[in-house]
Each structure stands twice: as structure tokens, then as C-alpha cells.
Interface confidence: medium
């Protein structure tokens, strides 16, 4: 099922044009998206086709800063959005308790070295519940066709994965078990091969700050949850978690 969702997400990616002709990279974004009032949405961008190191990603709504994900300093959510914005997954951002006022343009700004700055644009439309349901009825035939195609793809993937997993089951179990042991002990997990300075670390525990001093009780559970996610190749901003 995860593979299917990943494929659906990948098919929805849009490529954003770049400001400078000198830079080789491209930013892929989720493009134009809609969500229901009161619901939540994940904003995702992905930088590809460049070897530049990502030093920081800024998330902005029009001219307002929502969040920063810095390779060394970790996540920072703007104080005015802390109650409704959650870091991740990966370098993405989760917007919660959506209101109609959240409709508008969102930008992911990648600070990279040596390329410079890349910007991706996402347009979010927050719909009233009834409008969202009404819109969904028209999408059913299209979704049916897509679903049929995806069922074929997924079946093939599941067969391949099942065969591969039989061989790797023991090794995977041991890796995940090790991650769980580390998280249960409240230790900050850092990659065995630390990423080069200035790169956004791609294997971490819970998003930085979620397990701060004031959020201690849920820490082990969050660490466990995000460790499993990171094993499924979803990166995160920083390995820094506060435990004292």
C-alpha cells in the first residue's frame, strides 16, 4: 500500500521552472492542490538534477515565513504558525486545521551551495467540506482509470517486493530493532556515516524539536514512528532532538 501511495504522489509531482539559467537543478513540487477545510495537507518539494548541497530550506506563504529547515541547526517553525504547522515528512511541511484563509501560494526556497537559491511554488486551495465532496464526484471516473492502472503496477511491485523481502526479512528486522532500541532509550540517533557539512541530513529520528523538554512523554513513540518512516526512505531535516 505504501508503494502505491508513493507512486500516486510521484505522479502528481510538477516541475517548477528556475530563476537562473546557470543552475542545473529542478524543483519538483506537488503543484496545484486542494484540501478540505479543517483537514491537513502535506506540502512537498524535491530538488533534483544537481549535485549542490542543500544548506537550508525555507517554507513561505506569500511573504510570510512558515518554517526553516537548516542542515545544521534543525527545524524552526514560525511562532505564529506553531500550533498549525508540523515539520516533515522529510523537508516537507504539514499544514493542519486548514481554513479558507490558507488558500494561496506557498513557496519552498532551497538554499544550496554552490548553485544558490531554487524556488518551488505550490498553490493550495482550501475548500468547504461540501465543495470538496462535490468536486470529488467528478473525479471518480478518472480515479477509477488511474486506480486500474495502479493496481496492475502495484501487483507487480508487491510480487517483486515480497520475493525480495523473503531474502532480506532477517536483516531488515535487525535494522528496525536497532532503531527502536535507540529511540526507546531517548538517545539522539545520528547517521552511522555522517552526512557532509552543509547537507540536509537524510536519516534521522523524530523531527527536531518535537521531542523537546516540554514534549517528553511522547518522545519514544515519535522516535519509533519516524525511524520506521526514515527507513522507508523519507528523509528529515536534522537529527537534532532535545533530550536535555
Amino acid at each position: 500500500m505504501r508503494w502505491c501511495l508513493l507512486l500516486i504522489w510521484a505522479q502528481g509531482l510538477r516541475q517548477a521552472p528556475l530563476a537562473s539559467g546557470m543552475m542545473t537543478g529542478t524543483i519538483e513540487t506537488t503543484g496545484n492542490i486542494s484540501a478540505e477545510k479543517g483537514g491537513s495537507i502535506i506540502l512537498q518539494c524535491h530538488l533534483s538534477s544537481t549535485t549542490a548541497q542543500v544548506t537550508q530550506v525555507n517554507w513561505e506563504q506569500q511573504d510570510q515565513l512558515l518554517a526553516i529547515c537548516n542542515a545544521d541547526l534543525g527545524w524552526h517553525i514560525s511562532p505564529s504558525f506553531k500550533d498549525r504547522v508540523a515539520p516533515g515528512p522529510g523537508l516537507g511541511l504539514t499544514l493542519q486545521s486548514l481554513t479558507v484563509n490558507d488558500t494561496g501560494e506557498y513557496f519552498c526556497i532551497y538554499h544550496t551551495y554552490p548553485d544558490g537559491t531554487y524556488t518551488g511554488r505550490i498553490f493550495l486551495e482550501v475548500l468547504e467540506s461540501s465543495v470538496a465532496e462535490h468536486g470529488a464526484r467528478f473525479q471518480i471516473p478518472l480515479l477509477g482509470a488511474m486506480a486500474a492502472t495502479l493496481v496492475v503496477i502495484c501487483t507487480a511491485v508487491i510480487v517483486v517486493v515480497a520475493l525480495t523481502r523473503k531474502k532480506k526479512a532477517l536483516r531488515i528486522h535487525s535494522v528496525e530493532g536497532d532503531l527502536r532500541r535507540k529511540s526507546a532509550g531517548q538517545e539522539e540517533w545520528s547517521p552511522s556515516a555522517p552526512s557532509p557539512p552543509g547537507s540536509c541530513v537524510q536519516a534521522e529520528a523524530a523531527p527536531a524539536g518535537l521531542c523537546g523538554e516540554q514534549r517528553g512523554e511522547d518522545c519514544a513513540e515519535l522516535h519509533d514512528y519516524f525511524n520506521v518512516l526514515s527507513y522507508r526512505s523519507l528523509g528529515n531535516c536534522s537529527f537534532f532532538t532535545e533530550t536535555g
Epitope: 515565513l65 524552526h76 538554499h111 557539512p197 533530550t243
Partner: antibody
């Protein structure tokens, strides 16, 4: 409890170098960023730079680039700040400070090391 | 580079009085932090992100503001509150501090 203990006061001649240490205890050393800040007599606090203690990545204030070097000894849970080509205006108290993730602030500070540059 | 300017430079007040310290940014910023420093000591975190009191800070302290203007208020000064207060900002890739406001006994 978290503690940052810095090395003692230093007196240096212009043109010399100084290396200040900051020994951390009470937390996982490599899971935090360490910043260095200085304060000249009667002046505001001035940020020098930081070191990512997991991967030794550094970032410097442009003013100190090429003169300041931040390093660490993970086995000793100690961070170092070396400043070269000292001049009289480098006379200041130098602080190490741990970065508080998510708030983007410095939550624990060393007691400070006075570096006097005088001929 | 964003510059933080604190005012006044010195505030002379008596215990029990109300103190209002200002921190102005040269352009709009998301938040500031406040630190307290006493002579011969290292700065201590006092207020995080505009208004969150650091651990152990008494409720007579409060922070407010937005955009370019931020304020630290001490509702009724106690003898131990006389010190220098600095505001601080992280603005990629630089950390900047205000020049400080000294709260002294009148």
C-alpha cells in the same frame, strides 16, 4: 545537568593565536550545535560562528572568516575556538553556547573566557 | 543584514516600578529572543520567541511584539532584575544581538 566549562583567561600579544576550549557534560555532545559568541568590554554580544558537533560542519560570521577556526574533540566532549592574527580589538570575553533546536536560541552558556591582547 | 536596535540604552528605575524595554529590527522579522546578563556572568536565556518565558523565569516578565517592534516588560521590578537585557535574532545565515538595555537602580 547540562554544563559548559571553558578554559581560563589568556593574555596574548598582537599577531599571536589563542585557542579556547569548552567542555560539555550532562547531554549527548554530538547531538547539538555549539556556537561561539564574544563580548568586548562595554560592547554588544557578537556571534563568531557555530560547529555542528555531529559532522564538524561549520558556519562563520563573515567578519571572522579566515581568522576563526572551530573544532571539536568528540571523545573529550570538548569544542574549541581558535582565533589567529590577534589584534587589540579582539580583547573580549569569549563564550561557547549550546543551540536549542526548534527555538533557534542558545539555551546553555559557558562561563566565558577573557582573552586580553596586549603588547 | 538585519540590525537590532534596543532602546533605551539605560533605564533608571526603582524597585516596584514597571520597566519597558524595546527591540527594533531594521526590517520585519519573525521573532526575537531575550537574554539577561549580570556583571561578570554569561548571558542567560530569558524569553524565547517573543513571549515564552524560559524555565524558572518569574511571571512578572512578559514579552510581546511583531514585525519590526518587540518589547520586554517587567511589571514590578525586583532587586534581582537589575541587569542588562539583550534581544537576539537568527536571520540566515547570521545571528545578531541588540546592543543591550541596562536596567539600573535609580
Amino acid at each position: 545537568q547540562v554544563q559548559l566549562v571553558q578554559s581560563g583567561a589568556e593574555v596574548k600579544k598582537p599577531g599571536a593565536s589563542v585557542k579556547v576550549s569548552c567542555k560539555a557534560s550532562g547531554y549527548t555532545f554530538t547531538s547539538y550545535v555549539m556556537h561561539w559568541v564574544r563580548q568586548a568590554p562595554g560592547q554588544r554580544l557578537e556571534w563568531i560562528g557555530y560547529i555542528n558537533l555531529n559532522n564538524d560542519g561549520t558556519k562563520y560570521n563573515e567578519k571572522f572568516k579566515g581568522r576563526a577556526t572551530l573544532t571539536s574533540d568528540k571523545s573529550a566532549s570538548t569544542a574549541y575556538m581558535e582565533l589567529s592574527s590577534l589584534r587589540s580589538e579582539d580583547t573580549a570575553v569569549y563564550y561557547c553556547a549550546r543551540w536549542r533546536v526548534y527555538y533557534y536560541a542558545m539555551d546553555y552558556w559557558g562561563q566565558g573566557t577573557l582573552v586580553t591582547v596586549s603588547s | 543584514e538585519i540590525v537590532l536596535t534596543q532602546s533605551p540604552a539605560t533605564l533608571s528605575l526603582s524597585p516596584g516600578e514597571r520597566a519597558t524595554l524595546s527591540c527594533n529590527a531594521s526590517s520585519s522579522v519573525d521573532y526575537v529572543h531575550w537574554y539577561q546578563q549580570k556583571p561578570g556572568q554569561a548571558p542567560r536565556p530569558w524569553i524565547y520567541e517573543i513571549s515564552k518565558l524560559a524555565s524558572g523565569i518569574p511571571a512578572r516578565f512578559s514579552g510581546s511584539g511583531s514585525g519590526t517592534s518587540y518589547t520586554l516588560t517587567i511589571s514590578s521590578l525586583e532587586p534581582e532584575d537589575f541587569a542588562v537585557y539583550y534581544c537576539q535574532l537568527w536571520n540566515y545565515p547570521l545571528i545578531t544581538f541588540g546592543q543591550g538595555t541596562k536596567v539600573e537602580i535609580k
